[in-house]
């Protein structure tokens, strides 16, 4: 029950996270004009990964796509790539995890297969979350660098004259959405990996099976299980005359699919 809950919660958290990563990638407000020195402005500029926008005081907004591919900064291209990789991995992870959910029965799928799929999706979610966090962090670092460079330029103009012409950009809403979404996807992935441990069948020690001869009390103890049981040196099938007495290890047991949680 706990495993199913962990897996289900991991799936839901990852789903929310990936939806957030998609939203952040599509959002225009990755960087917004810094209004600290100029709170009353006729126009407000903000930029996304795909286009830049200008909003007038009237509320009218005009956006322009970055129609060039080669002219864009390498860092912006890298951020785009990281976010897209994150979305793709997350989407595949979601698809895999749907089939891995314990509450969904698909044919006669083994629990071991579900465990493997859960682990795969978990790893995909972790990588997806890391991609999103990395992408957002790279962009944030780019903004911080540019912000302080433009601040330095502002106050070290010609002959120390103050220049307030340059527009400085600060963190936009998309960055926070991206960080939170990446974190959620990461957490969801970790939860899926934890759930996988509970789903995976533990190495079942198939105990030796005792067979009783009709005439004599003879138990045949196959020794071929040495590797899996870690017991004695019964490499050949030795006859053991024990008068029909059986140790606890020798009690006949059949592996059941309910033997493990």
């Amino acid at each position: 029950m706990a495993v199913t809950a962990c897996q289900g919660l991991g799936f839901v958290v990852s789903l929310i996270g990936i939806a957030g990563i998609i939203a952040a990638t599509c959002m225009d407000q990755w960087s917004t004009q810094d209004l600290y020195n100029n709170p009353v402005t006729a126009v407000f500029n903000y930029q996304g990964l795909w286009r830049s926008c200008v909003r007038e005081s009237s509320g009218f907004t005009e956006c322009r796509g970055y129609f060039t591919l080669l002219g864009l900064p390498a860092m912006l291209q890298a951020v785009r790539a990281l976010m897209i990789v994150g979305i793709v991995l997350g989407a595949i992870g979601l698809l895999v995890s749907i089939f891995a959910l314990k509450c969904i029965r698909i044919g006669s799928m083994e629990d071991s297969a579900k465990a493997n799929m859960t682990l795969t999706s978990g790893i995909m979610f972790i990588v997806s979350g890391l991609c999103a966090i990395a992408g957002v962090s790279v962009f944030a670092n780019m903004l911080v660098t540019n912000f302080w460079m433009s601040t330095a330029n502002m106050y070290t103009g010609m002959g120390g004259m103050v220049q307030t012409v340059q527009t400085r950009y600060t963190f936009g809403a998309a960055l926070f959405v991206g960080w939170v979404a990446g974190g959620l996807t990461l957490i969801g992935g970790v939860m899926m990996c934890i759930a996988c441990r509970g789903l995976a069948p533990e190495e079942t020690n198939y105990k030796a099976v005792s067979y009783h001869a009709s005439g004599h009390s003879v138990a045949y103890k196959p020794g071929g299980f040495k590797a899996s049981t870690g017991f004695g040196s019964n490499t050949k099938n030795k006859k053991i005359y024990d008068g029909g007495a059986r140790t606890e290890d020798e009690v006949q047991s059949y592996p059941s699919k309910h033997d493990y949680v």
Epitope: V43, E56, F60, E62
Partner: nanobody, 118 residues
Framework: QVQLDESGGGLVQPGGSLRLSCAAS?????MGWFRQAPGKGLERVAN????????WLADSVKGRFTISRDNSKNTLYLQMTSLRAEDTAVYYC??????????????WGQGTLVTVSS
């Protein structure tokens, strides 16, 4: 150079209607209407992107004004209904070559006066 000729202004009673027209000498990227009330600054009213027909209307006129265009005639229209006294202003037709932003407006009309009074 693009020539813009406005028409349709005049005196109208509150609650009445008017239709302003603006004919451009050639096609532009964007066309719109701005207005300037007596003693006030220039205010954007509405605009339309000529290529795809995307429109924008100021909150103060939403539900009352509609903007439309006829690309074959390079003409812009502003249908004004339920007019109020605060709509009294000189209405300017504007056109942009590559942007609709006020700072990027390349061409302006001479303006047409709309007076809403009983």
């Amino acid at each position: 150079q693009v020539q813009l000729d406005e028409s349709g202004g005049g005196l109208v009673q509150p609650g009445g209607s008017l239709r302003l027209s603006c004919a451009a000498s050639r096609s532009t990227y964007c066309m719109g209407w701005f207005r300037q009330a007596p003693g006030k600054g220039l205010e954007r009213v509405a605009n339309v992107y000529m290529r795809n027909g995307d429109t924008w209307l100021a909150d103060s006129v939403k539900g009352r004004f509609t903007i439309s265009r006829d690309n074959s005639k390079n003409t812009l229209y502003l249908q004004m209904t339920s007019l109020r006294a605060e709509d009294t202003a000189v209405y300017y037709c504007a056109a942009g070559r590559s942007s609709c932003l006020e700072a990027s407006i390349s061409y302006w009309g001479q303006g047409t006066l709309v007076t809403v009074s009983s």
